[in-house]
Interface confidence: low
């Protein structure tokens, strides 16, 4: 028996279903009473999932896992994984015996997309050219950790002066924060862009600073 | 009864290209990964590449990467090795192979002979 | 320099029993099944042993295989003129993302 599985991670959104494929090509005359099949992490070998002796064993892993069992006898031994958690990224490994037997990895890559960045200023009046201002951007809820970038009205890349850190939560997802210090010209826009590497998702977030007052562009 | 016929081997000159083909019969082509392997002229066997059975997802040696490219059209049973770039270490006899991890019926092969 | 290391060649009476050897490392032998194959001379090479010990129909019972841990061996019993081939290793490899065989052993049946 030959299985196989996707070559290309699965990226799931935190709190969807995944499901993680695995297939193999039964024999004719091939019933399920001669099908052993395990789930297991690839690293740990904690069983995830099982089939064996003619029965779903049902799920070992948190209750959140169930086969296709009218699909079994056609070959499909994909895994299904509820409500999916950032602890539930990594590789899992999918063994379907026979007579002989063989296996392959899949990998789980969780994600989520985040917020649009909101942005505030110190100070935040009597501003004037040639003060020095800290601009913060902060977006939530993401994973995994984001890239931040920073440019001018311009669009040029603001490199210089900016400290972004990330805090993960009890779910594990991040809380960004980038401050970005700036001598102010007589007017200006800054703007943050948070991306999400995994889901190729940008988060924007600007402020124009022109003398008095301050605007906030609206959400696009 | 199984079989597997390759051709499209040749003379090329380093630096050309050539397309191998894989004529498969007698299982359902389309449910199996399949292989390709060479043997170079008094050497051992080195795999070369793999194709899950849909296509999409391919597998290659380093020493071919990004200079061959395998691919199958599973309406005609057949497999194919795209080889450019060619280089006289290329020089082999290609046998494809049934299965991904397992090559449990190989072709007699064809020549590939890469010189000036 | 191959992935799997086998000795270059082994040799035998007709009726002994040989062993070659196998070695690889955690991220081929070491959790992926091994699988021989036999090449006689002109031919094109034919599935021996696969899933570490498991012979497809038609292979005689004098060949078997086993694995332990990072290592994987061929046995022939009762040798005969007819065995007189290459024998290649081969398993996945994890780290590489790639097919692994090891050199090859030349098995020679004397007399």
């Known amino acids: 028996v030959e299985v196989q599985v996707s070559e290309d991670p699965v990226v799931a959104l935190v709190d969807t279903d995944a499901t993680l494929r695995c297939s193999f090509s039964p024999e004719p005359g091939f019933s399920l009473a001669q099908l052993n099949l395990i789930w297991q992490l690839t690293d740990t070998k904690q069983l995830v999932h099982s089939f064996t002796e003619g029965r779903d064993q049902g799920s070992a892993y948190s209750n959140r896992t169930a086969l296709f069992p009218d699909l079994l006898v056609q070959g499909n031994a994909s895994l299904r994984l509820q409500r999916v958690r950032v602890t539930d990224e990594g590789s899992y490994t999918c063994f379907v015996s026979i007579q002989d037997f063989d296996s392959a990895a899949v990998s789980l890559q969780v994600a989520a997309p985040y917020s649009k960045p909101s942005m505030t200023l110190e100070p935040n009046k009597d501003l004037r050219p040639g003060n020095m201002v800290t601009i913060t951007c902060s977006s939530y809820q993401g994973y995994p950790e984001a890239e931040v970038f920073w440019k001018d009205g311009q669009g040029v890349p603001l490199t210089g002066n900016v400290t972004t850190s990330q805090m993960a939560n009890e779910r594990g997802l991040f809380d960004v924060h980038s401050v970005l210090r700036v001598v102010l010209g007589a007017n200006g826009t800054y703007s943050c862009l948070v991306r999400n590497p995994v889901l190729q998702q940008d988060a924007h977030g600007s402020v124009t600073i022109t003398g008095q007052p301050l605007t906030f562009p609206p959400e696009a | 009864e199984v079989q597997l016929l390759e051709s499209g081997g040749g003379l090329v000159q380093p630096g050309g290209s050539l397309r191998l083909s894989c004529a498969a019969s007698g299982f359902t082509f389309s449910s199996y990964g399949m292989s390709w392997v060479r043997q170079a002229p008094g050497k051992g066997l080195e795999w070369v590449s793999g194709i899950y059975s849909g296509g999409s997802s391919k597998y290659y040696a380093d020493s071919v990467k990004g200079r061959f490219t395998i691919s199958r059209d599973n309406s005609k049973n057949t497999l194919y090795l795209q080889m450019n770039s060619l280089r006289a270490e290329d020089t082999a006899v290609y046998y494809c192979?049934?299965?991904?991890?397992?090559?449990?019926?190989w072709g007699q092969g064809t020549l590939v002979t890469v010189s000036s | 320099q191959s992935v799997l290391t086998q000795p270059p060649s082994a040799s035998g009476t007709p009726g002994q029993r040989v062993t070659i050897s196998c070695t690889g490392s955690?991220?081929?032998?070491?959790?992926?099944?091994v699988t021989w194959y036999q090449q006689l001379p002109g031919t094109a090479p034919k599935l021996l042993i696969y899933?570490?010990?498991h012979r497809p129909s038609g292979v005689p019972d004098r060949f078997s295989g086993s694995k332990s841990g990072t290592s994987a061996s061929l046995a022939i019993s009762g040798l005969r003129s007819e065995d007189e081939a290459d024998y290649y290793c081969?398993?996945?490899?994890?780290?590489?993302?790639?097919?692994?065989f090891g050199g090859g052993t030349k098995l020679t049946v004397l007399g």
């Open positions: 955690s991220s081929n032998i070491g959790s992926n099944s």
């Open positions: 899933s570490d010990s």
């Open positions: 081969g398993t996945w490899d994890a780290s590489l993302n790639a097919y692994v």
């Open positions: 192979a049934k299965n991904r991890l397992r090559f449990d019926y």
